[in-house]
Interface confidence: low
């Protein structure tokens, strides 16, 4: 049976396509190509007579067509208007006709897309942002990438307008991007330049460091304030409610007991209009506030090596203190298997190994005094491997 095949089926605009013919009968008088799904003299592209080897252009000939003796038709510099069906009519020597229809689709070479946004400086937890991938083109697939990854399933991410528009509901500071859109059709793909969002947020509640409360007279008091904010926060300091200075750092040399009091850091974001404050009590004293002896507890004191994990907890009722851990007079953590958490109150060892056996204790301290817990002993056992058939393991 006479058939025709398009090579390729999907063609890029400006390229060429070859309509191949299979199972061409013997004893031919000639053949003719037509635009469309049927034989229509008004839409003839070209006719070919075998005897004279003469090709005759038809009404639908554009000058870009070449017919070959094997009946294949080459169309060069294709346009989107060339998309569609093509019919070959073969006139056999007995003047009985056979027909076959093929088709191909012409797609444009896609341009580099760009991203437009309705709001490039959104406010956190307040604004929504709609990104649109330009241009809008037919027969095009739109894809979006955030941080070079495809879109996660999220109630705050919505696609609309045939995936051409990506909307972020209630943006957060983590939504800065970059965002890219990609357009695809069967013959080409192109990705936009990345776009980032400048999400305005904060300030969050400021943190005053260091965390120490107690200071000796004559020491230098150096406090630093930080609040996550975009744009960066403006800071000011108040002591006992009285404004001091508009800086992020507060430095008072050679302090006396008169410098005891409430130290307030005020953070302001002029764009969001939000303010946050944190108050810290500073006590300057000759007296040593004695830190109470901490309690140490273990989730278990006898464990199996290379299998079990253990948590050691250091408990204290004192505030404004720091905690450190010791094992065989060494400061911890000493390996990647040891992790401190919850303000250093918990020491986790996972997994426990033979070398972790021994005495542990914790120490609580403030700038003026410190105290140690009683030691706790951790025993590490190794289970003997089961033996089979009287053979030694390994």
């Amino acid at each position: 049976q006479l058939t025709t095949e398009s090579m390729p089926f999907n063609v890029a605009e400006g390229k060429e396509v070859l309509l191949l013919v299979h199972n061409l009968p013997q004893q031919l008088f000639g053949y003719s190509w037509y635009k469309g799904e049927r034989v229509d003299g008004n839409r003839q592209i070209v006719g070919y007579a075998i005897g004279t080897q003469q090709a005759t252009p038809g009404p639908a000939n554009s000058g870009r067509e070449t017919i070959y003796p094997n009946a294949s038709l080459l169309i060069q510099n294709v346009t989107q208007n060339d998309t569609g069906f093509y019919t070959l009519q073969v006139i056999k020597s007995d003047l009985v006709n056979e027909e076959a229809t093929g088709q191909f689709h012409v797609y444009p070479e896609l341009p580099k897309p760009s991203i437009s946004s309705n709001n490039s400086n959104p406010v956190e937890d307040k604004d929504a942002v709609a990104f649109t991938c330009e241009p809008e083109t037919q027969d095009t697939t739109y894809l979006w990438w955030i941080n070079n990854q495809s879109l996660p399933v999220s109630p705050r991410l919505q696609l609309s307008n045939g995936n051409r528009t990506l909307t972020l509901l209630s943006v957060t500071r983590n939504d800065t991007g970059p965002y890219e859109c990609e357009i695809q059709n069967p013959v080409s793909a192109n990705r936009s330049d990345p776009v980032t969002l400048n999400v305005t947020y904060g300030p969050d509640t400021p943190t005053i460091s260091p965390s120490d409360t107690y200071y000796r007279p004559g020491a230098n008091l150096s406090l630093s304030c930080y609040a996550a904010s975009n744009p960066p926060a403006q800071y000011s300091w108040l002591i006992n409610g009285t404004f001091q200075q508009s800086t992020q750092e507060l430095f008072i040399p050679n302090i006396t007991v008169n410098n005891s009091g409430s130290y307030t850091c005020h953070a302001n974001n002029s764009v969001t209009g939000c303010n946050r404050t944190t108050v810290k009590t500073i006590i300057v004293t000759e007296l040593s506030p004695v830190v109470a002896k901490p309690q140490i507890k273990a989730s278990k004191t006898t464990v199996t090596g290379d299998k079990d994990s253990v948590n050691l907890t250091c408990s204290t009722n004192d505030t404004g203190i720091s905690i450190r851990w010791f094992f065989k007079n060494q400061s911890l953590p000493s390996s990647e298997r040891m992790k401190l958490s919850q303000g250093n109150t918990t020491l986790s060892i996972n997994p426990v190994k033979r070398e972790d056996a021994g005495t542990y204790w914790c120490e609580v301290f403030n700038p003026i005094s410190k105290n140690q817990s009683d030691p706790i002993m951790l025993n590490v056992n190794y289970n003997a491997l089961p033996q089979e058939n009287g053979l030694s393991p390994g």
Partner: antibody, heavy 124, light 107 residues
Amino acid sequence: EVQLLESGGGLVQPGGSLRLSCAASGFTFINYAMNWVRLTPGKGLEWVSVISGSGSGTYYADSVKGRFTVSRDNSKNTLYLQMNSLRVEDTAIYYCASPPPMVRGVIITIGNYWGQGALVTVSS
Amino acid sequence: EIVMTQSPATLSVSPGERATLSCRASQSVSVNLAWYQQKPGQAPRLLIYGASTRATGIPARFSGSGSGTEFTLTISSLQSEDFAVYYCQQYNNWPFTFGPGTKVDIK
């Protein structure tokens, strides 16, 4: 006018299967995420699953994960819920729910339009 | 998953009185919270979304407030058609979750 019409409910034995359908009309179906929500006598409303407009993204409540599968045929404007390994506690009225068309210019996934519900009874 | 709780479980109110329903989330859901009304034999009806925005066609006597973890639905003057079960639902994080509901009945 937005319309949602569920079908496929009925009586099924524990361990059995059932497939619910929801025919949608009155809005551009492919543009919107769709939800299944159920009403049980003891627990009230319980969100079951969601599927993104294209069908590529799905999410399930823990109680049905691994047993229920949500899908959609955008050419038919139809949403489906395939329910396998059904349990007595799955007995409920099942609603499909679509979001409101626009909120502040953006599409969200709360249920503004609801079907009339399909009763699923799991009993031996 | 985010757990939603509602209080009270039942609220008995006389027609014309004010009703205040509470909803609490186990973690912050920003303002991504909706309120629904459901009557026996009917599908739920969206009243409020975005914690405080009334859905199309909802009377002004219904109002919502709150953000983060604490939310309130207020019916300023109860009408006879308002006696129903009211549910809150968070849509900030998958899986979406409903509260157990508050039944408002006639005193």
